[in-house]
């Protein structure tokens, strides 16, 4: 189908053609065209969509911050997965930054859990 048959103001222009929308929605990895006629693929490594949608734009892939490592790269159907570097962790109440894990426990306490990208070390009181 050329754009001329869809729209009197525009002639055919090359574009990535995929499939037709199903009940007005496009599958993960795609977005809908402006005339709702086509599902256009997201650009691998640049943008994505995770579910059936009528997005005019795919979602932009996250870029990992410095202090983070990329665990999974962005695909057309899944965003980048970033993780705090070794020795740092992300707190639930401040997820935007990776904080340094404590290097040891206070006096009178013992470490029961190591630092992970999601949690600081865990310390408990020594039994007397």
């Amino acid at each position: 189908i050329t754009r001329q048959s869809l729209d009197p103001q525009r002639r055919a222009a090359p574009q990535q053609k995929r499939s037709s929308p199903t009940e007005g929605l496009c599958p993960p990895g795609h977005h809908i065209s402006e005339d709702s006629r086509e599902c256009i693929s997201c650009k691998y490594g640049q943008d994505y969509s995770t579910h059936w949608n009528d997005f005019l734009f795919c979602l932009r892939c996250t870029k990992c911050d410095s202090g983070e490592v990329e665990v999974n790269s962005c695909t057309t159907t899944r965003n980048t997965v970033c993780q705090c570097e070794e020795g740092t962790f992300r707190e639930e109440d401040s997820p935007e930054i990776c904080r340094k894990c404590r290097t040891g426990c206070p006096r009178g306490m013992v470490k029961v859990k190591d630092c992970t990208p999601w949690s600081d070390i865990e310390c408990v009181h020594k039994e007397s």
Epitope: P14, G24, E34, D35, N53, D54
Partner: antibody
């Protein structure tokens, strides 16, 4: 013939609200993404908001996010822009336009919104 | 957001001359998503070129668009009196859609 006709502009005080409408004809309205574009007096063009054909996806410029809401009624072939918490810098001619990404191929005549006390 | 910078700001030319307008993007824009508009005082903009080089319906062939990546050009081969206006480029590659600041083509 494609026609887009805006209405609802006028003079409003800072902090006030206004709802713009755009009546569309001459094409299958429900199939097409639509946008609002504005132009402040003596300035250039600024995209404001867009909505997919079904109305399921909406997009906003940072300058209006949280204050403006785009919507559409496909049974009435009408596009809307609800503008709240208006500021002096929102003063502009507001155009309804067909399209978003590949160019705005049809435009309304525009409706003037003036925000002033 | 993608910033579009148009140059020159004003172009002073005589009817019959060739006009070359430039639009530079701050990051790469797919040719599919680059458009040009003409606007005359008191009027709504009019789509001239879409897809970087395709003329919209009813646009005379003296208007042509070219370019790719970050550099795009609108050329008016021979200026007619009705061509003196402001011209804008616009991208739809990534949200938000953005316009250049405009180039005014005025009579010398």
């Amino acid at each position: 013939e494609v026609q887009l006709l805006e209405s609802g502009g006028g003079l409003v005080q800072p902090g006030g609200s206004l709802r713009l409408s755009c009546a569309a004809s001459g094409f299958t309205f429900s199939s097409y993404a639509m946008s609002w574009v504005r132009q402040a007096p003596g300035k250039g063009l600024e995209w404001v908001s867009a909505i997919s054909g079904s109305g399921g996806s909406t997009y906003y410029a940072d300058s209006v996010k949280g204050r403006f809401t785009i919507s559409r009624d496909n049974s009435k072939n009408t596009l809307y822009l609800q503008m709240n918490s208006l500021r002096a810098e929102d003063t502009a001619v507001y155009y309804c336009a067909k399209g978003v990404r590949k160019g705005f191929d049809y435009w309304g005549q525009g409706t003037l919104v003036t925000v002033s006390s | 957001e993608i910033v579009l910078t148009q140059s020159p700001g004003t172009l002073s030319l005589s009817p019959g001359e060739r006009a070359t307008l430039s639009c530079r993007a701050s990051q790469s824009v797919s040719s599919s998503y680059l458009a040009w508009y003409q606007q005359k005082p008191g009027q709504a903009p009019r789509l001239l070129i879409y897809g970087a080089s395709s003329r919209a319906t009813g646009i005379p062939d003296r208007f042509s668009g070219s370019g790719s990546g970050t550099d795009f050009t609108l050329t008016i081969s021979r200026l007619e009196p009705e061509d003196f206006a402001v011209y804008y480029c616009q991208q739809g590659e990534s949200p938000p859609p953005t316009f250049g600041q405009g180039t005014k083509v005025e009579i010398k």
